[in-house]
């Protein structure tokens, strides 16, 4: 988890399509009751935007204190501001909660740039626009932080939805979702629809805008089109998956697929960009530049630093290629692909553009910690985190931004051999995953 690149903004071996469709597990057979269908009360419960994160309203303590909490599938702590901070409108006041219990233990979470630290405790937590339950959960009360909270982001804490293995200070601290599933009848699954605006939002528009949906305990069919395709969760720490092939406008990058997953590939709602390992990033940018070679953009644009602006409404989406990631399927030797548009990987930037201009940052960047499928990817898709069956599902999001010529896609099956070889085995050490 890289502060400075992660939010809080701290921004293969593919084959030809099969003639006949391989069997795949979609969402026809519910595992638990109430797991599928309509979750009206949870639809549209997220706000925010990709550059500053998506947040859900939660209540903590007795009487309930309402806070906006960043939804982060790339970490595993529930941590909230618990002391005054210039960027916080409100914070958790433990002394006002009759149900707060102090664990008499500290927690320190350093990032590449910045950090937060706090005191551990438990309290009663609920999600007003979520399941109608209250759980006692571990809470890190953030008492000190550096470059963690974002001015104007409108959130006051972070909900780490990944697994206990990466919880701080150690894996004995039960993450919120584990507590929720243990203490209630909520199925062990959640799904996210992050809706990128496709255009810059000013502060008042963000506060008024709908950012998407977090469906806790199920799948809402109204949030996606087509079929859900599932990829196995390789290991339960981050939401780790395996990418087996990458294409730019249908052209295979032709790299050893291990490179795509070096040293891991994760699905992370708390990261803005699609982040790629150095070699993969360089090959991808070279290919994207070649595909859009009728134009020449400044070096700083490809580094995600400079903005490119076009007169409002004239952004030449057609000159930019689509990007396809092939993911390991659930069936042996079968993969599927998810395809994003430039509308996802060119991120609209507020404040800079005039009413005459639409300005964008290139939202694909280099990583030293593996591939991170951040908001740039997730905004194209409805993503199902099916923890019960150790898999992640992708379908085309009903809210993704596209044009009249191209749309994001989830397609399959494709024959792909030796996919297990695409995974990288990280040498087992005790080093901090947050410090890499």
């Amino acid at each position: 988890t890289q502060h400075g690149i992660r939010l809080p903004l701290r921004s293969g071996l593919g084959g030809a399509p099969l003639g006949l469709r391989l069997p795949r597990e979609t969402d026809e057979e519910p595992e638990e009751p109430g797991r599928r269908g309509s979750f009206v009360e949870m639809v549209d419960n997220l706000r925010g935007k990709s550059g500053q994160g998506y947040y859900v309203e939660m209540t903590v303590g007795s009487p309930p204190q309402t806070l906006n909490i960043l939804v982060d599938t790339g970490s595993s702590n529930f941590a909230v501001g618990a002391a005054p901070h210039p960027f916080l409108h409100r914070y958790y006041q433990r002394q006002l909660s009759s149900t707060y219990r102090d664990l008499r233990k500290g927690v320190y979470v350093p990032y590449t740039q910045g950090k937060w630290e706090g005191e551990l405790g438990t309290d009663l937590v609920s999600i007003p626009h979520g399941p109608n339950v209250t759980v006692r959960a571990n809470i890190a009360a953030i008492t000190e932080s550096d470059k963690f909270f974002i001015n104007g982001s409108n959130w006051e804490g972070i909900l780490g939805l990944a697994y206990a293995e990466i919880a701080r200070p150690d894996d004995s601290l039960e993450p919120f979702f584990d507590s929720l599933v243990k203490q209630t009848h909520v199925p062990n699954l959640f799904s996210l629809q992050l809706c990128g605006a496709g255009f810059p939002l000013n502060q008042s528009e963000v506060l008024a805008s709908v950012g998407g949906s977090m469906i806790i305990g199920g799948i809402d069919h109204s949030l996606y089109t087509g079929s859900l395709w599932y990829t196995p969760i390789r290991r339960e720490w981050y939401y780790e998956v395996i990418i087996v092939r990458v294409e730019i406008n249908g052209q295979d990058l032709k790299m050893d697929c291990k490179e795509y997953n070096y040293d891991k590939s994760i699905v992370d709602s708390g990261t803005t960009n699609l982040r790629l390992p150095k070699k993969v990033f360089e090959a991808a940018v070279k290919s994207i530049k070649a595909a859009s070679s009728t134009e020449k953009f400044p070096d700083g644009f490809w580094l995600g630093e400079q903005l490119v602006c076009w007169q409002a409404g004239t952004t030449p989406w057609n000159i930019f290629p689509v990007i396809s990631l092939y993911l390991m399927g659930e069936v042996t030797n079968q993969s599927f692909r998810i395809t994003i548009l430039p509308q996802q990987y060119l991120r609209p930037v507020e404040d800079v553009a005039t009413s005459q201009d639409d300005c964008y940052k290139f939202a694909i960047s280099q990583s030293s910690t593996g591939t991170v499928m951040g908001a740039v990817i997730m905004e194209g898709f409805y993503v199902v985190f099916d923890r019960a069956r150790k898999r992640i599902g992708f379908a085309v999001s009903a809210c993704h931004v596209h044009d009249e010529f191209r749309t994001a896609a989830v397609e399959g099956p494709f024959v792909t051999l030796d996919m297990e070889d695409c995974g990288y085995n990280i040498p087992q050490t005790d080093e901090s995953t947050l410090m890499t």
């Epitope: 134009e295 020449k296 400044p298 400079q306």
Partner: antibody, heavy 120, light 108 residues
């Protein structure tokens, strides 16, 4: 070394079209590393970016002038040109052509400039 | 739109003195800022790009600093040929169309 030289009439009548050409010598206009741009400076005033072109013909214009500006490139002659239609006295300025280098961001090489007066 | 404000409008100094010119952006432009020098009757010349990098052939007495919104061009010891107008330009937003209004450095 590479040089830029503007050429064209020094006097244009109101409502007519101003036409200027920039000739690139000592290097190729077809280099993929550069854009080629036009900037103007009214007498005693500051610099105003007009627009620029890539050898492929891709153009970028200042929105305030866009409806009147056309920039084109002739790679066979190693030249690029500016046309500004429906001119008025406010278009009187020294017109510079320049190369956009240093990571396609900064005007790292300029022509000497040519004064164009709009008057009847 | 990002606006660049240069100050002072005029700086009256003697040869050998130190000149400090300011350029302030209405919002952050990171380090994507350039400085140009223009002598009377001549075209502008690139002095500094990337806020602090000297362009080819520019003497060491010229230095640039700053990032975000506040930038400074310093001429450590003015030579007679340094009396000119200096412009800043931001290219954080591209295409590179925004110049400051200029600072005239004149002989006192």
């Amino acid at each position: 070394q590479l040089q830029l030289q503007e050429s064209g009439p020094g006097l244009v009548k109101p409502s007519e079209t101003l036409s200027l050409t920039c000739t690139v010598s000592g290097g190729s206009i077809s280099s993929s590393s550069y854009y080629w741009g036009w900037i103007r400076q009214p007498p005693g005033k500051g610099l105003e970016w007009i627009g620029m072109i890539y050898y492929s013909g891709s153009t970028w214009y200042n929105p305030s002038l866009k409806s009147r500006v056309t920039i084109s490139v002739d790679t066979s002659k190693n030249q690029f040109s500016l046309k500004l239609s429906s001119v008025t006295a406010a278009d009187t300025a020294v017109y510079y052509c320049a190369r956009v280098g240093h990571g396609v961001s900064y005007f790292d090489l300029w022509g000497r400039g040519t004064l164009v007066t709009v008057s009847s | 739109e990002i606006v660049l404000t240069q100050s002072p409008a005029t700086l009256s100094l003697s040869p050998g003195e130190r000149a400090t010119l300011s350029c302030r952006a209405s919002q952050s432009v990171s380090s994507y800022l350039a400085w140009y020098q223009q002598k009377p009757g001549q075209a502008p010349r690139l002095l500094i790009y990337g806020a602090s990098k000297r362009a080819t052939g520019i003497p060491a007495r010229f230095s640039g600093s700053g990032s975000g919104t506040d930038f400074t061009l310093t001429i450590s010891s003015l030579e007679p040929e340094d009396f000119a107008v200096y412009y800043c330009q931001q290219v954080y937003t591209w295409p590179p169309r925004t110049f400051g209004g200029g600072t005239k450095v004149e002989i006192k």
